[in-house]
């Protein structure tokens, strides 16, 4: 159902927004432990004027990498809704710009078991910090697009 503009963003509000808010709500406690360092993704991908579609396309692609994070079924379901829903709605608005497929992650060097455990914990926290920021940026970017469609 491809009428994001004609229904004043109802597709977004009733599906994407609900899932984004559910995800963010479940991540309320994440933030205080997050490092201040800027993630490379947000240095490179900005929800800027005329580039909203490009940003959301890559953000949706990035979200799919979090679908196997050993999280609850509900969490994964909401992630899937946001990722797939964003891609579908971008196709609706004609904002999507296809790119080359994402490269696979590089293998990490072998570490001792204890070192590995703390590294894994740090990586998981880092991933959750990134995911929370990504969801916030996706939400902001969709709102920016919808404000634009309501103005015109």
């Amino acid at each position: 159902d491809c009428d994001i503009e004609g229904k004043d963003g109802k597709q977004y509000e009733s599906v994407l927004m609900v899932s984004i808010d559910q995800l963010l709500d479940s991540m309320k406690e994440i933030g205080s432990n997050c490092l201040n360092n800027e993630f490379n993704f947000f240095k490179r991908h900005i929800c800027d004027a005329n580039k909203e579609g490009m940003f959301l396309f890559r953000a949706a692609r990035k979200l799919r990498q979090f679908l196997k994070m050993n999280s609850t079924g509900d969490f994964d379901l909401h992630l899937l809704k946001v990722s797939e829903g964003t891609t579908i709605l971008l196709n609706c608005t004609g904002q999507v710009k296809g790119r080359k497929p994402a490269a696979l992650g590089e293998a990490q060097p072998t570490k001792s078991l204890e070192e590995n455990k703390s590294l894994k914990e740090q990586k998981k926290l880092n991933d959750l910090c990134f995911l929370k920021r990504l969801l916030q940026e996706i939400k902001t970017c969709w709102n920016k697009i919808l404000m634009g469609t309501k103005e015109h």
Epitope: D48, F55, R99
Partner: antibody, heavy 117, light 111 residues
């Protein structure tokens, strides 16, 4: 429209310090990364440093011991503190707003710094 | 650091000519399916202006006669039909790795 205006350049003696400013307008300054880039007379472009929306910084290690980037979001202003200046630091210094792909999407007009005794 | 080598360093061309500038990186500037290569135009006494970002994307307001291509280490900026206002110096810049680095520039002069 996006506007960046540098100030603080001038003639300074070797070994002295200088602070450059860049006043931003036409966009939500606090949500964007901003950079300093310089260009020596008749030469190419050289990236110095960046500061991100959360305040974290990246430096070209060739300058990190002498140059410090900072920002004041309440004043929509970017700064570059330059210490122990040398003759080879003579250049036009530009501030630039971060763009898609970590490009330099918008530039100021530049401010000339001349290090000379 | 990633070294950027631009060629030629200067060229003479006439209005209407097709101009090609190349940029070679000392290592790949690709990541996660994208190429982090940007192109700028600079006129004497002025600040640089972004033309192309991420190898092939035309910046808003830039004429369609400018195009970018390439991936990995080899990139090209093409001006399909040179206009009088295009006589300037062009720089490539990689943003895949800090420090961000520029090519030495290509000066496009009137023949």
């Amino acid at each position: 429209q996006v506007q960046l205006v540098e100030s603080g350049g001038g003639v300074v003696q070797p070994g002295r310090s200088l602070r450059l400013s860049c006043a931003a307008s036409g966009f939500t300054f606090s949500t964007y990364g901003v950079h300093w880039v310089r260009q020596a007379p008749g030469k190419g472009l050289e990236w110095l440093a960046a500061i991100w929306s959360g305040g974290s910084t990246d430096y070209n290690v060739a300058f990190s011991s002498r140059f410090t980037i900072s920002r004041d979001n309440s004043k929509n202003t970017l700064y570059l503190q330059m210490n122990s200046l040398r003759a080879e630091d003579t250049a036009v210094y530009y501030c630039a707003r971060n763009g898609y792909g970590e490009s330099f999407a918008y530039w100021g007009q530049g401010t000339l710094v001349t290090v000379s005794s | 650091d990633i070294q950027m080598t631009q060629s030629p360093s200067s060229l003479s061309a006439s209005v209407g000519d097709r101009v090609t500038i190349t940029c070679k990186a000392s290592q790949s500037v690709d990541d996660d399916g994208d190429s982090y290569m940007n192109w700028y135009q600079q006129k004497p006494g002025k600040a640089p202006k972004l033309l192309i970002y991420m190898a092939s994307n035309l910046e808003s307001g830039v004429p369609a006669r400018f195009s970018g291509s390439g991936s990995g280490t080899d990139f090209t900026l093409t001006i399909s039909s040179l206009q009088p206002e295009d006589f300037a110096t062009y720089y490539c810049q990689q943003s895949n790795e800090d420090p961000l680095t520029f090519g030495g520039g290509t000066k496009v002069e009137i023949k």
